[in-house]
Interface confidence: low
């Protein structure tokens, strides 16, 4: 029998990767360092598929309904050129509300649609992150 | 029902500036990024750029960055546009536009009626 | 900037005929991509979006296909109301670009 990788402890196992939800406040680049600094591999959550989106979504609710969390999706040249800071490919997508814009541009899983959406926000606002990485 | 209406016609001398509105109703504009667009006469739609009203951030096409000021007043859920150093290049119909959320790829799906800028001596 | 080339510039068809318009993107687009009818001193009005998703409340004889940087607009039994000028636009990044129009006549 196959055993499936362990992952880091308090960090939850789906499909292949790792996930640590952590209800610390961080802007979005100190967000992304503290995931580094776990080792592994690990960075901020990128979010390939609904599976993958909604598998996320019902952990986080297992805590909280109310605060947005960020997500490892960011726009570094303020030209709506998205890009997952892992580096996997921005193809999935799930935005949801206003279309995005002005100053917004780091991705937060938002919680006024069970986490299942995602909404841009101003990079420097303090928020719970999502963590992950390939054991 | 989301609507969106434009000022009137507008008949300017070259070098001068004008100011266009778009006022929404049926929907709050803190809401929406409301954009702006160019038709030439007789020829295809140009991006100008688009507001956020709810924090007053603009994002341009490079080529109106001079051109253009958009501003947003929410307390009468109005949009404008400011063109200045008019030249016959800019006599167009201007149009302001929101785009949809992304569960409508962003598209623009509501359109004002247009104002036509005449720039003349 | 990515840019898109719309073919043909125009086309002059019968009441009752297929259309088919083509859009070509300078880079893959990833389906943010919609299609506008203009009809003569009127606003653009959004057609479809996303590639393939009709608008609300536009007739089913439309329909939007494609992927990546092609994509295409057909209209099934033409009609007369159809006449109009049609434009492609992409939403990939700013800024967004338009097509250069295909001018649609009834013959």
């Known amino acids: 029998q196959i055993q499936r990788p362990s992952c880091a402890p308090g960090w939850f196992y789906h499909k292949s990767n790792c996930y640590g939800y952590f209800r610390k406040l961080r802007n979005w680049s100190d967000a992304e360092l503290e995931c580094q600094s776990y080792g592994n591999g690990a960075h901020l959550a990128s979010i390939l598929s609904l599976k993958e989106a909604s598998t996320i979504a019902e952990y986080i609710s297992g805590y909280q309904r109310s605060q947005p969390i960020w997500i490892g999706l960011h726009d570094p040249q303020k030209r709506q050129q998205w890009q997952w800071i892992d580096g996997a490919m921005y193809l999935y997508r799930s935005w949801s509300g206003k279309s995005m814009g002005g100053n917004k541009h780091c991705a937060e899983m938002s919680s006024n649609n069970n986490f299942l959406t995602w909404s841009s926000n101003e990079c420097n606002k303090r928020q719970h992150f999502l963590c992950k990485y390939r054991p | 029902e989301i609507q969106l209406q434009q000022s009137g016609t507008e008949l300017v001398r070259p070098g001068a500036l004008v100011k266009l509105s778009c006022k929404a109703s049926?929907?709050?504009?803190?809401?929406?990024?409301i954009n702006w667009l160019k038709q030439r006469p007789e020829q295809g739609l140009e991006w100008i750029g688009w507001i956020d009203p709810e924090n007053d951030d603009t994002v341009f096409d490079p080529k109106f960055q001079d051109k253009a000021i958009l501003t947003a007043d929410t307390s009468s859920n109005t949009v404008c546009l400011q063109l200045s150093s008019l030249t016959s290049e800019d006599t167009s119909v201007y149009y302001c536009?929101?785009?949809?959320?992304?569960?409508?790829?962003?598209?623009?799906?509501?359109w004002g009626q247009g104002t036509l800028v005449t720039v003349s001596a | 900037d990515i840019q898109l080339t719309q073919s043909p510039a125009s086309l002059s068809v019968s009441v009752g005929e297929t259309v088919t318009i083509t859009c070509r993107a300078s880079?893959?687009?990833?389906?943010?991509f919609a299609w506008y009818q203009q009809t003569q001193g009127k606003s653009p009005q959004l057609l479809v979006h996303?590639?393939?998703s009709l608008a609300d409340g536009v007739p089913s004889r439309f329909s939007g296909s494609g992927s990546g940087t092609q994509y295409f607009l057909r209209i099934d039994s033409l009609q007369s109301e159809d006449l109009g000028i049609y434009y492609c636009?992409?939403?990939?990044?700013?800024?967004?670009?338009f097509g250069g129009g295909t001018k649609l006549e009834i013959k």
């Open positions: 049926g929907f709050n504009i803190r809401d929406y990024y």
């Open positions: 636009q992409h939403f990939w990044n700013t800024p967004y670009t």
């Open positions: 996303g590639a393939t």
């Open positions: 536009a929101i785009k949809g959320n992304y569960y409508d790829g962003g598209a623009f799906a509501n």
């Open positions: 880079e893959n687009i990833y389906s943010n």
